[in-house]
């Protein structure tokens, strides 16, 4: 698994460097998670032909994965820092159950899957410190999450492969949109 942000050899070799700002730390954290997703996608794509499927075909699924929309205030048109930040945190909290599902779905990248999950928890904490309006953030219901997890794990092998691929792709897209918006804040 890759070394978590702030622990690479460059950081150790340069103790005199300015400490990272909150925004830089968040930026680095998201890039670290994106690297992890990239490694997981490699294993998934090597194992099945899901990665060749068209986006349109993959869109026909019953997963309710978080996605950015105009109303969320994270795009240039209608950009709203506070609304967007709430959407990012809420979306990441909603992704947590899907990241839990990804655990045990990988053979050679088991550690990587765990790293993505744990790094996302840390990212949520970073972002919650940045948010002013924490009351607007709705936390997913644990009972609903538990039954969703059971349902996903009961799928046949092909559907589980498809689900894994969709989660990774959607999570990547959500993080990309989130980071682009955060870079405007």
């Amino acid at each position: 698994a890759p070394v978590p942000p702030g622990e690479d050899s460059k950081d150790v070799a340069a103790p005199h460097r300015q400490p990272l700002t909150s925004s830089e730390r968040i930026d680095k954290q998201i890039r670290y998670i994106l690297d992890g997703i990239s490694a997981l996608r490699k294993e998934t794509c090597n194992k099945s032909n899901m990665c060749e499927s068209s986006k349109e075909a993959l869109a026909e699924n019953n997963l309710n994965l978080p996605k950015m929309a105009e109303k969320d205030g994270c795009f240039q048109s209608g950009f709203n820092e506070e609304t967007c930040l709430v959407k990012i945190i809420t979306g990441l909290l909603e992704f947590e159950v899907y990241l839990e599902y990804l655990q045990n779905r990988f053979e050679s990248s088991e550690e990587q899957a765990r790293a993505v999950q744990m790094s996302t928890k840390v990212l949520i904490q970073f972002l919650q410190k940045k948010a002013k309006n924490l009351d607007a953030i709705t936390t997913p219901d644990p009972t609903t999450n538990a039954s969703l997890l059971t349902k996903l794990q009961a799928q046949n092998q092909w559907l589980q492969d498809m689900t894994t691929h969709l989660i990774l792709r959607s999570f990547k897209e959500f993080l990309q949109s989130s980071l682009r918006a955060l870079r405007q804040m």
């Epitope: 795009f75 240039q76 990547k172 990309q176 949109s177 682009r180 870079r183 405007q184």
Partner: nanobody, 124 residues
């Protein structure tokens, strides 16, 4: 890193149009975000527009919003910058840059590959 080549620059009259292209032979170019920056003589290089791996995620500098359009054709490994209603103050060398994380941004530090630039001159 990917090798980027800009083209499409030239001399145009105020109010005219140009379409810049940024092309690469890189295999996974569709996964990169691409930004356009420009540098006028004696000035700092500045952000113009960018497009994410998801083509709907586009951002523009206030000065070009509504006049310039960024788009991508992943089948051709090319990102375009369509510039309409050009003004003399748009005169600059235009550079494209790529971000392997597919995110982009309005600062140069977010990009890991750069092209050599193409000259755009707006003058009557």
């Amino acid at each position: 890193q990917v090798q980027l080549v800009e083209s499409g620059g030239g001399l145009v009259q105020p109010g005219g149009s140009l379409k810049l292209s940024c092309t690469t032979s890189g295999r996974r170019f569709s996964e990169y975000a691409v930004g356009w920056f420009r540098q006028a003589p004696g000035k700092e290089r500045e952000f113009v527009a960018d497009i994410g791996e998801q083509a709907e995620n586009t951002w523009y500098a206030e000065s070009v919003l509504g006049r310039f359009t960024i788009s991508r054709d992943d089948a051709k490994n090319t990102v375009y910058l369509e510039m309409d209603g050009l003004k003399p103050e748009d005169t600059a060398v235009y550079y494209c840059a790529a971000d392997k994380y597919g995110v982009g941004g309005n600062a140069q530090g977010y990009y890991d590959s750069w092209g050599q630039g193409t000259q755009v001159t707006v003058s009557s």
